[in-house]
């Protein structure tokens, strides 16, 4: 048994006579043999659900669900209730109605086994019948909405008549009907004014019925019509088996360069016309099991369940449904030497589905794991300026397809043929498995005999120790010019273009800092700043070379405080700044301030 509503509303007036009928509550059956029995909760409740008093005023007919006044609610009783409303004005009280037997905690009132009945209290006696407007004669102030479970026996779920009005104003004739299209499953009995379902409903065909209730009032020669919405929602049960959209029960996948744990290898989609179980219960009651195959497969893959609500068209209206994505995911990083082909089966079970048929599906994943070979081009040729400063980035080395790698740990090393000309270093970038070449020793750069540098680049897969090698030829160009006195170690210190460009700083490939002119659009990613190389700094990312020294690019790497208009970077640096941003790495501070517009004018005058 279940209530067709979770809440009911009626009006209460001072000194309304004992015996006055108030309203009916209705229960619908889950099974044909069920017989409803209603029970009122012990207490009346006020604002914020606080108990006010034992309910001594309202009774219920256990078999019919009729609520009526057992005793008149007078001024003093209402005052007594108001005093107990924890200091809030008392305008509405409510009762709880339970269906017997109930498994509910008495203290909780939750649909389907409990409904709240709200009474708006009017500190006046019931108005004269002639003064009541048609709207007041027809419908409660709060519009009802109904909930009906699909596949359940038909039954009565509403009674249109306002009982106090009918009881106290018998001379006013009120008639009701439902406006509905052809073939809808509802009926309003003209004599009893009870609304019932004609047959069991199917949510997968229609989930919402937006009906209209029409009330016609006859008072003497007067006839007036009032219309209100009469919405019915059909509640779901697990009566649909899971299916494969377009019959696709197999997915094929190749694992090659993406070998990292948590990589999604393949996805299969399952469709279920139901929206139960609810999201909180779903993963527990809608299970997926990777069927035992070989131990390697069990350890290497897992299945992740990702349910999502969708809507599908049925009989011209949209109803909700669920799509379940089952993702085959790598459970661990795969070595580049792994080379296997296998078929995996996943059993999906909609455990709440009662039939007919089975709520079970078998998903198939055909997976090929291909080995990866490490290859480097035979030779790299690069040039570097003699003026380059330490940590200047001068190029990249990368095994074939390294940009596509994930879960493959390649380390790069440089072996120099001339011991005294070992100028460069290499660090492996975690982002794209490439090796970044940078200036490590500026003294060697300046030696005249170090005009051409020869290296062997060795790439090693850390897991398997497999290697690839390449020649690296570096030409040293230009001549060394000593830097102006008083230049800071970090380009980022400079606040103006002129001072920026006449100094070098750590990380500068040319020996001179570069000015990046911002777009001046408030707090922007493209703020003005002084950088060792605008190719790499700032770019919103503190790369593996920049991490070696905070002076290289504090705009990307600083963990300290940023003063002025800015948006902090994740996890460090300046994501966006206002005007010009300059930094003092030693003090762990950056400042973002409006552009200094005097600068260009001053330059012109000084010339």
């Amino acid at each position: 048994l279940y209530f067709s509503r979770d809440a009911y509303w009626e009006k209460l007036y001072v000194d309304q006579a004992a015996g006055t009928p108030l309203l009916y509550v209705h229960a619908l059956r889950d099974a044909p043999e069920e017989v409803p029995s209603f029970r009122l909760g012990q207490h009346l409740y006020g604002t914020y659900r606080t108990r006010l008093h034992e309910n001594n005023w309202i009774c219920i007919q256990e078999d019919t669900g009729l609520l009526y006044l057992n005793r008149s609610l007078d001024h003093s009783s209402w005052e007594k209730l108001s005093v107990r409303n924890r200091g809030f004005p008392l305008l509405t009280v409510y009762l709880k109605v339970f269906l017997s037997p109930t498994s509910l905690r008495e203290g909780e009132c939750q649909w389907p086994g409990c409904a709240r009945v709200y009474f708006s209290f009017f500190n006046t006696s019931f108005p004269a019948c002639s003064s009541l407007k048609p709207r007041e004669l027809c419908f409660p102030e709060t519009r009802p909405s109904f909930r009906i479970r699909e596949n359940r026996p038909p039954g009565t779920f509403h009674q249109f008549r306002l009982l106090p009005v009918q009881f106290l104003c018998p001379n006013i004739s009120v008639a009701y009907r439902l406006l509905e299209g052809e073939g809808l499953p509802f009926r309003c009995a003209p004599d009893s004014l009870e609304v019932s379902t004609r047959w069991a409903l199917d949510r997968e065909q229609r989930e919402k019925y937006e009906l209209v209730a029409v009330c016609t009032v006859h008072a003497g020669a007067r006839e007036e019509v009032v219309m209100v919405p009469f919405p019915v929602t059909v509640y779901d049960e697990d009566d649909s088996a899971p299916t494969f959209p377009a019959g696709v029960d197999t997915a094929s996948a190749v694992v090659e360069f993406k070998r990292k744990e948590d990589t999604v290898v393949a996805t299969l989609r399952v469709f279920d016309a139901d929206v139960v179980p609810a999201s909180g219960e779903l993963v527990r009651r809608y299970t997926s099991t990777l069927l035992p195959g070989d131990t390697w497969a069990q350890q290497t893959f897992r299945v992740e369940h990702w349910p999502n609500e969708t809507s599908v068209q049925a009989n011209g209206s949209f109803v909700r449904a669920t799509v379940h994505d089952y993702r085959l995911v790598l459970n661990r990083n795969l070595s580049i030497s792994e080379n296997r082909t296998m078929q995996l089966a996943v059993l999906v079970n909609d455990s709440d589905f009662q039939g007919p048929g089975a709520g079970v599906l078998l998903l198939h994943f055909n997976v090929s794991v291909l080995p990866v070979s490490l290859h480097l081009p035979s030779t790299y040729s690069l040039s570097v300026s003699r003026r380059a400063r330490r940590f200047a980035q001068i190029g990249k080395v990368c095994v074939e397809n390294c940009q596509a790698f994930s879960g493959i740990n390649v380390q790069y090393k440089l072996h120099s043929s001339g011991a005294n000309c070992s100028t460069l270093g290499v660090v492996t970038s975690a982002e794209d498995t490439s090796g970044i070449l940078f200036v490590n020793d500026t003294k060697a750069l300046r030696r005249p005999k170090c005009a051409e540098l020869h290296y062997m680049v060795v790439a090693t897969d850390q897991q398997t120790s497999r290697q690839a090698q390449a020649q690296l030829l570096v030409t040293v160009e230009g001549s060394y010019v000593a830097e102006e006195a008083g230049c800071p170690l970090s380009c980022a210190v400079s606040k103006r273009r002129l001072e920026c460009e006449e100094c070098g700083g750590l990380g500068s490939p040319t020996g001179r800092c570069e000015w990046r002119q911002g777009d001046g659009k408030g707090i922007t990613r493209n703020f003005s700043t002084c950088s060792p190389s605008t190719k790499t700094c700032p770019d919103g990312h503190c790369d593996v070379v920049e991490t070696q020294d905070i002076n290289i690019c504090p705009q990307d790497c600083l963990r300290g405080s940023i003063v002025g208009g800015h948006e902090p970077g994740e996890p460090r640096g300046i994501k966006a700044g206002y005007g010009t941003c300059n930094c003092f790495p030693e003090e762990e501070k950056c400042f973002c301030e409006p552009e200094d517009i005097q600068d260009p004018l001053c330059d012109e005058l000084c010339r």
Epitope: R51, G107, E108
Partner: antibody, heavy 122, light 107 residues
Framework: QVQLVESGGGVVQPGRSLRLSCAAS????????MHWVRQAPGKGLEWVAV????????YYADSVKGRFIISRDNSKSTLYLEMNSLRAEDTALYYC???????????????WGQGTTVTVSS | DIQMTQSPSSLFASVGDRVTITCRAS??????LGWYQQKPGKAPKRLIY???ILESGVPSRFSGSGSGTEYTLTISTLQSEDFAIYYC?????????FGQGTKVEIK
């Protein structure tokens, strides 16, 4: 009718343990939070512990925290109080009581047992 | 923890008297206070909860009032069966705490 019956009291030496039980009948035990309250001879009432209706949560008075453990078996409609490292000051009449909880509010304890006596003495 | 201070600790009264017992909380307990009656050798019995709601079956001569930190139990016309010890209990936050009790004795 609604009834709570405590048992398991007795004389025990300091430092020893004792387990009290409270058998409930006449109501849906699994729907109610349950409490232990004690009263030392000639003294006032002292709240001891509570356990949620579903066993998901518990609270203790500072005087018993870390020594007493409240538990329940909803299938047997029984509340327990495991009392360890007993002291002379734990000597009291121990009552079990049903919590009155409604729509998110606590309203104290509405049904009490008759109590069981615990005497801690060497 | 919330402390409950109950006064007086004892009082002497005659049948027909009006009796008032007060409980003060160390902080606002938002109406979450109950009154319990205990007779010798018996378990406590709830008279009033949520400051002013009378327990079913309790005579209407008992009434409760108060808010914030100050609460009162009133017996409008004392009867012979009302001679007992009365306790207040705050049920606003754990640990719940009782007042020390008020013994109502025959004058």
């Amino acid at each position: 009718q609604v009834q709570l019956v405590e048992s398991g009291g007795g004389v025990v030496q300091p430092g020893r343990s004792l387990r009290l039980s409270c058998a409930a009948s006449g109501f849906s035990f699994s729907s109610y939070g349950m409490h232990w309250v004690r009263q030392a001879p000639g003294k006032g009432l002292e709240w001891v512990a509570v356990m949620w209706y579903d066993g998901s949560n518990e609270y203790y008075a500072d005087s018993v925290k870390g020594r007493f453990i409240i538990s329940r078996d909803n299938s047997k409609s029984t509340l327990y109080l495991e009392m360890n490292s007993l002291r002379a000051e734990d000597t009291a009449l121990y009552y079990c009581a049903r919590e009155d909880w409604d729509e998110g509010y606590y309203y104290g304890m509405d049904v009490w047992g008759q109590g069981t006596t615990v005497t801690v003495s060497s | 923890d919330i402390q409950m201070t109950q006064s007086p600790s004892s009082l002497f009264a005659s049948v027909g008297d009006r009796v008032t017992i007060t409980c003060r909380a160390s902080q606002d307990i938002r109406y979450d206070l109950g009154w319990y009656q205990q007779k010798p050798g018996k378990a406590p019995k709830r008279l009033i909860y949520a400051s002013s709601i009378l327990e079913s079956g309790v005579p209407s001569r008992f009434s409760g009032s108060g808010s914030g930190t100050e609460y009162t139990l009133t017996i409008s016309t004392l009867q012979s069966e009302d001679f007992a010890i009365y306790y207040c209990l705050q049920h606003n936050s754990f640990p719940w705490t009782f007042g020390q009790g008020t013994k109502v004795e025959i004058k």
